[in-house]
Amino acid sequence: YDFTNCDFQKIEADYLRTISKDLITYMSGTKSTDFNNTVSCSNRPHCLTEIQSLTFNPTPRCASLAKEMFARKTKATLALWCPGYSETQINATQAMKKRRKRKVTTNKCLEQVSQLLGLWRRFIRTLLKKQ
């Protein structure tokens, strides 16, 4: 999906209002220095691409994020403010229903959510110095 035409201001507002709080709740008990930033993004559409990938694409060591509250709210926000996003996600959602839900929050999931927090922070940032 091409995130170029999303309403970035509305997505930013949703993130600050709810998604950020859910991410921080998920990460409670860990320090911001516990994990290195290994994923970055270079503009707002790119950030949303990476956020979608980390939130909804299961990895071998962290398969459960899509069921979390922050993921559900992320999905709703993207569906609301990115034209045509919902239609592209129908197949992905059907595939997701076939997977078993993991109840354990693994260290790898914490690491992945730490990366997500970093990506969201980059998404909402504006360069103070354009140079």
Epitope: T38, S40, S42, N43, H46, E50, R122, L127, K129, Q131
Partner: antibody, heavy 122, light 108 residues
């Protein structure tokens, strides 16, 4: 562990070519701008070239423009520097380094390789 | 093209504060980054975006930037701080990374 490992350095005669490579691991290579920086013996750091995260934007130092070519392969997590028409003044340790990028602004060079030595001599 | 000027050398007594300057025309409008390089080693980022510090760098390292001068401050200097220090900016006008000439810090 985040790592950059350069290779391909060596001794080469003036006017000849050399190709440097940099293998990235431990981070999502495709999301970072990548640079080459060099350091002549006993001298300071000199920036050589940058390629954007997607490969769409490329910029060179004036001293190497038209002779050096920077490329990346995001599927293999590798950065390359093709150096043609080498001169004695190109003798240096060449470092591969990464930086986060926002639009067309490249941020701090936060991870560096250990460097590979290039000697141009007849 | 944009030029960054650093003093070639700075000395500090152990336990004292060292200040390394980086001069440039209206440098305060740029984000300045600082690197430490010990002999035979690759540079290491010590301060970024004027005054932020990577998590692995001690709090003794700090930075500031305004007007025509950026400053790297190293408090409570130690022998292990002896190194070359480089300032750096990205110039959007020339599309170049620009480094200062480097400053050799000696802990007396």
């Amino acid at each position: 562990q985040m790592q950059l490992v350069e290779s391909g350095g060596g001794v080469v005669q003036p006017g000849r070519s050399l190709r440097l490579s940099c293998a990235a691991s431990g981070f999502t290579f495709r999301t970072y701008g990548m640079h080459w920086v060099r350091q002549a013996p006993g001298k300071g750091l000199e920036w050589v070239a940058v390629i954007s995260y997607s490969g769409s934007y490329i910029h060179y130092a004036d001293s190497v423009k038209g002779r050096f070519t920077i490329t990346r392969d995001n599927s293999k997590n590798t950065l390359n520097l093709q150096m043609n028409s080498l001169r004695a003044e190109d003798t240096a340790v060449y470092y591969c380094t990464r930086s986060p990028q926002w639009e067309e602004v490249y941020e701090a060079l936060d991870i560096w390789g250990q460097g590979t030595m290039v000697t141009v001599s007849s | 093209s944009y030029v960054l000027t650093q003093p070639p050398s700075v000395s500090v007594a152990p336990g004292q504060t060292a200040r390394i300057t980086c001069g440039g025309n209206n440098i305060g409008s740029f984000s300045v980054h600082w690197y430490q390089q010990k002999p035979g080693q690759a540079p290491v980022l010590v301060v970024y975006d004027d005054s932020d510090r990577p998590s692995w760098i001690p709090e003794r390292f700090s930075g500031s930037n305004s007007g025509n001068t950026a400053t790297l401050t190293i408090s409570r200097g130690e022998a292990g701080d002896e190194a070359d220090y480089y300032c750096q900016v990205w110039s959007s006008t020339s599309r170049h990374v620009v480094f200062g000439g480097g400053t050799k810090l000696t802990v007396l």
